[in-house]
Amino acid sequence: IPVIEPSVPELVVKPGATVTLRCVGNGSVEWDGPPSPHWTLYSDGSSSILSTNNATFQNTGTYRCTEPGDPLGGSAAIHLYVKDPARPWNVLAQEVVVFEDQDALLPCLLTDPVLEAGVSLVRVRGRPLMRHTNYSFSPWHGFTIHRAKFIQSQDYQCSALMGGRKVMSISIRLKVQKVIPGPPALTLVPAELVRIRGEAAQIVCSASSVDVNFDVFLQHNNTKLAIPQQSDFHNNRYQKVLTLNLDQVDFQHAGNYSCVASNVQGKHSTSMFFRVVESAYLNLSSEQNLIQEVTVGEGLNLKVMVEAYPGLQGFNWTYLGPFSDHQPEPKLANATTKDTYRHTFTLSLPRLKPSEAGRYSFLARNPGGWRALTFELTLRYPPEVSVIWTFINGSGTLLCAASGYPQPNVTWLQCSGHTDRCDEAQVLQVWDDPYPEVLSQEPFHKVTVQSLLTVETLEHNQTYECRAHNSVGSGSWAFIPISAGAHTHPPDEFLFTP
């Protein structure tokens, strides 16, 4: 560690005095100290001498000697007071900048340690300090305002009592900067804008920050717009607002608008798109297929997306038949707004009944006119089967009628014994009817098909079964010939609760 001569922590001299500070180290040494005039520096190998033959109050301060080659970075210091009866303060800075909650050191160095008892800190023009200003004093360093607040950004003076009167230092400006967490917060409204050519429009870009030092601008398709800025301060934040007012929009006003704000922490930007159209529009669409098939008893939500400008003047869901004149219950119709110009309308159809199959239409109206979107809802049913014995053209025939949706397929089985349903072990013969006759096939109704099985002789200890199936399920009917005539056996009671 270097050694300073004189080997005292502080030295008090009078103005005009000669002062010599000598530093000796193992290697070359260097001096650092407050910016001050009149010093002469002599360096010779491992020693360095600071000297002045005309000390002034401006030489007051701490002088530190270091050894650049010392890996431990040791240093020695001496504090010099030049006690000028006319100049109690040596002020080392015009301004002090700190962040909020840091200690702010105002570097008024007392030129005479004897004056320490009578020092105080004031605001310029003799104004007292703000309430809750917590400060301390060091004759070597000056006044420290502890945990400085933004509101304490003021011009200060250091005061010392000399011969019963207060002598002020030159002023020091304290700037307490807000700790800026990041770039300014931004809003750009609206998030999307549509106007018909000739209408008025407004776009508002606003930015806010805890610190006033930030910039904000609005640009259209990368061109910065010259818009007057409104400034405000509330909720402890500075706000800057740019409002673009367009009295009569035209196609050149359309495009991308970006609100950009920046400060020392960085930049934020947000964008919106402005569409200018020739006339009102109303577009209906659905992500669903307009032809819907649902199993009876299940539920369905029909969804329509609406894109419109100007806004809707009316809308409703309508049932167009064919089964009844009932209309969807309003409570089952739901509207959600995705954004200003896009909406979703949902019709909920829970536990569908046979009478609810048919066409559902969503109608909407705005100044651009009416639009409609129609869904066709067909219900799916498992097959219902019945078998009768009859004679056709003199031949004994089993006639199977199957009704369901989608159209059922028919299979005949002949099996031994009397049974409600043929199982694999009993089956004697199987006939598939690939093309049963379609008896009825109307939109939104079940499809009824008929299959004929010509039987020359009915075997009395056997069962004839007609089975029908489709994508929903299957049904069957067992026919058991008996000596007194034919006996038919439907399957167990088919329970259906819509």
Epitope: E30, W31, D32, G33, P34, P35, S36, P37, H38, W39, T40, L41, L50, T66, L92, A93, Q94, E95, V96, V97, V98, Q102, A104, L105, P107, H141
Partner: antibody, heavy 117, light 108 residues
Framework: QVQLQESGPGLVKPSETLSLTCTVS????????WSWLRQPPGKGLEWIGY???????NYNPSLKSRVTISVDTSKNQFSLELSSVTAADTAVYYC???????????WGQGTTVTVSS | EIVLTQSPGTLSLPPGERATLSCRAS???????LAWYHQKPGQAPRLLIY???SRATGIPDRFSGSGSGTDFTLTISRLEPEDFAVYYC?????????FGQGTKVEIK
């Protein structure tokens, strides 16, 4: 050894604020004075101001009304803000260690800032 | 503020020659607070001399400084190819710190 590195945007629009940061490595920012200087294209050097680690600052009077220099000892950085810039502020900006008795003994490599719309 | 005026504006010399650069102050400058720098194109300035006559670390002894009061001189005893650059004097004893306008030393 002590090294300084300037950083910040190379292009600033007129009337906006120029912000630069100088990162110090190889020395504690808490020991010395640290200066900002600039050099317009083809011209000489102009001192902007210096700061001590405690936040004490002296500015060039010609720029004082537009300049703020601050220090962040936790990051070993000091910063320059120059407000309301014009084309006349286009320059290479340097940071330097500023020593009472030895002049500016360590410099950053400089960063070019252009003021243009 | 202290104004520093350097002369000549440009000095054209061949390598190996002696170069003498002058810096004049508008008011007294303590020799402790006068420095010389040189700057090559595209580079930052580099400290050559501090305290009017002390060489900075790593500066060859062909560079020397002298002077006091208002007149200061930088001498390069034998110009090397790497010495062709712009040279600035600076005072750092009073605020604001000021620089001379520079002397360009070019190869003749």
């Amino acid at each position: 050894q002590v090294q300084l590195q300037e950083s910040g945007p190379g292009l600033v629009k007129p009337s906006e604020t120029l912000s630069l940061t100088c990162t110090v490595s190889g020395a504690s920012i808490s020991t010395y004075f640290w200066s900002w200087l600039r050099q317009p294209p083809g011209k000489g050097l102009e001192w902007i101001g210096y700061i001590f680690y405690s936040g004490s600052i002296n500015y060039n009077p010609s720029l004082k009304s537009r300049v703020t220099i601050s220090v962040d000892t936790s990051k070993n950085q000091f910063s320059l803000e120059l407000s309301s810039v014009t084309a006349a502020d286009t320059a290479v900006y340097y940071c330097a260690r500023d020593r009472t008795f030895y002049g500016m003994d360590v410099w950053g490599q400089g960063t070019t800032v252009t003021v243009s719309s | 503020e202290i104004v520093l005026t350097q002369s000549p504006g440009t000095l054209s010399l061949p390598p190996g020659e002696r170069a003498t650069l002058s810096c004049r102050a508008s008011q007294n400058v303590s020799s402790t607070y006068l420095a010389w720098y040189h700057q090559k194109p595209g580079q930052a300035p580099r400290l050559l001399i501090y305290g009017a006559s002390s060489r900075a670390t790593g500066i060859p002894d062909r560079f020397s400084g002298s002077g006091s009061g208002t007149d200061f001189t930088l001498t390069i005893s034998r110009l090397e190819p790497e010495d062709f650059a712009v040279y600035y004097c600076q005072q750092y004893g009073s605020s604001p710190r000021t620089f001379g306008q520079g002397t360009k030393v070019e190869i003749k």
